[in-house]
């Protein structure tokens, strides 16, 4: 948790005091924000945002869609966050299927994970079709898979996010990449 000099406003404290938390689907999420100047909790995942004016955020039966970033803010505008993964073997990905890239720029395939401890988090072509040999990516369980330096040849590429679960590949819904030329 953050520490500052006496007299200076300090960011709120969150319990549990860790940056990431993994809970199982159906279990309780209980997050406490300790700050005399508490203002609100904010929850964010993909394009969804929710607010809560209670200093204790309680979700009695967690679902995969409760996966995301929980931020507590105080009256000084200072904040602290915890990221919660709700592990659901039946829903490994949260998905926003819009996928646009500009040639030579990176673009994000938005398929954050509900379980950060899965393996082989990667991209697969649709219907077993090969991906471009030069395609490279950066995986981030909280955001998705960033395709590096999108090529014009990737336009209309159909792909899935993929992970391995108990020895089998599990695929997300499909994405179609639209590429804008650089000029």
């Amino acid at each position: 948790q953050p520490s500052v000099s006496p007299g200076e406003p300090s960011p709120p404290s969150i319990h549990p005091g860790k940056s990431d938390l993994i809970v199982r689907v159906g279990d309780e999420i209980r997050l406490l924000c300790t700050d005399p100047g508490f203002v609100k909790w904010t929850f964010e995942i993909l394009d969804e945002t929710n607010e809560n004016k209670q200093n204790e955020w309680i979700t009695e039966k967690a679902e995969a869609t409760n996966t995301g970033k929980y931020t507590c803010t105080n009256k000084h505008g200072l904040s602290n966050s915890i990221y919660v993964f709700v592990r659901d073997p039946a829903k490994l990905f949260l998905v926003d299927r819009s996928l646009y890239g500009k040639e030579d720029n990176d673009t994000l395939v938005r398929c954050p994970l509900t379980d950060p401890e899965v393996t082989n988090y990667s991209l697969k072509g649709c219907q077993g079709k090969p991906l471009p040999k030069d395609l490279r990516f950066i995986p981030d369980p909280k955001a998705g898979i960033m395709i590096k330096s999108v090529k014009r040849a990737y336009h209309r590429l159909c792909l899935h996010c993929s992970v391995d679960q108990e020895g089998k590949s599990v695929l997300s819904e499909k994405f179609i990449l639209k590429v804008r030329p650089a000029f």
């Epitope: 393996t119 991906l131 490279r136 990516f137 995986p139 981030d140 960033m146 590096k148």
Partner: nanobody, 126 residues
């Protein structure tokens, strides 16, 4: 330019364990990926495991899943391969590989990695 130095190989009995280390000197970025490959005499170099530097996401060959664990220490620029329940067929020279351009879509293809170590011998006796 990136230099990779492997260590930790040796002779072990079937069922035993070894931990390999690969120390990288040079710049590691968020795009970095480091992996382990192995090559047995007369065979092609094969993928074992890889890890993305930024998020620590892990990738494994089916043949080692559940037995081998790849991990990283960012502060030391080092990647580890913990090998448990070793089998005679795990005998090979183990090579550390790295690339600064991101995880290849075909991360098991050794031709897609730019930097290689000299290798460390692992021998599993029955």
């Amino acid at each position: 330019e990136v230099q990779l130095v492997e260590s930790g190989g040796g002779l072990v009995q079937a069922g035993g364990s070894l931990r390999l280390s690969c120390a990288a000197s040079g710049r590691t970025s968020g795009s970095y990926v480091m992996g382990w490959f192995r090559q047995a005499p007369g065979k092609e170099r094969e993928f074992v495991a890889a890890i993305s530097w930024s998020a620590g996401m892990t990738y494994y060959a089916d043949s080692v899943k559940g037995r081998f664990t790849i991990s990283r220490d960012n502060a030391k620029n080092t990647v580890y391969l913990q090998m448990n329940s070793l089998k005679p067929e795990d005998t090979a020279v183990y090579y550390c590989a790295a690339d600064q351009r991101g995880v290849p879509a075909y991360y098991s293809d050794y031709a897609l990695y730019d930097y290689w170590g000299q290798g460390t011998q692992v021998t599993v006796s029955s």
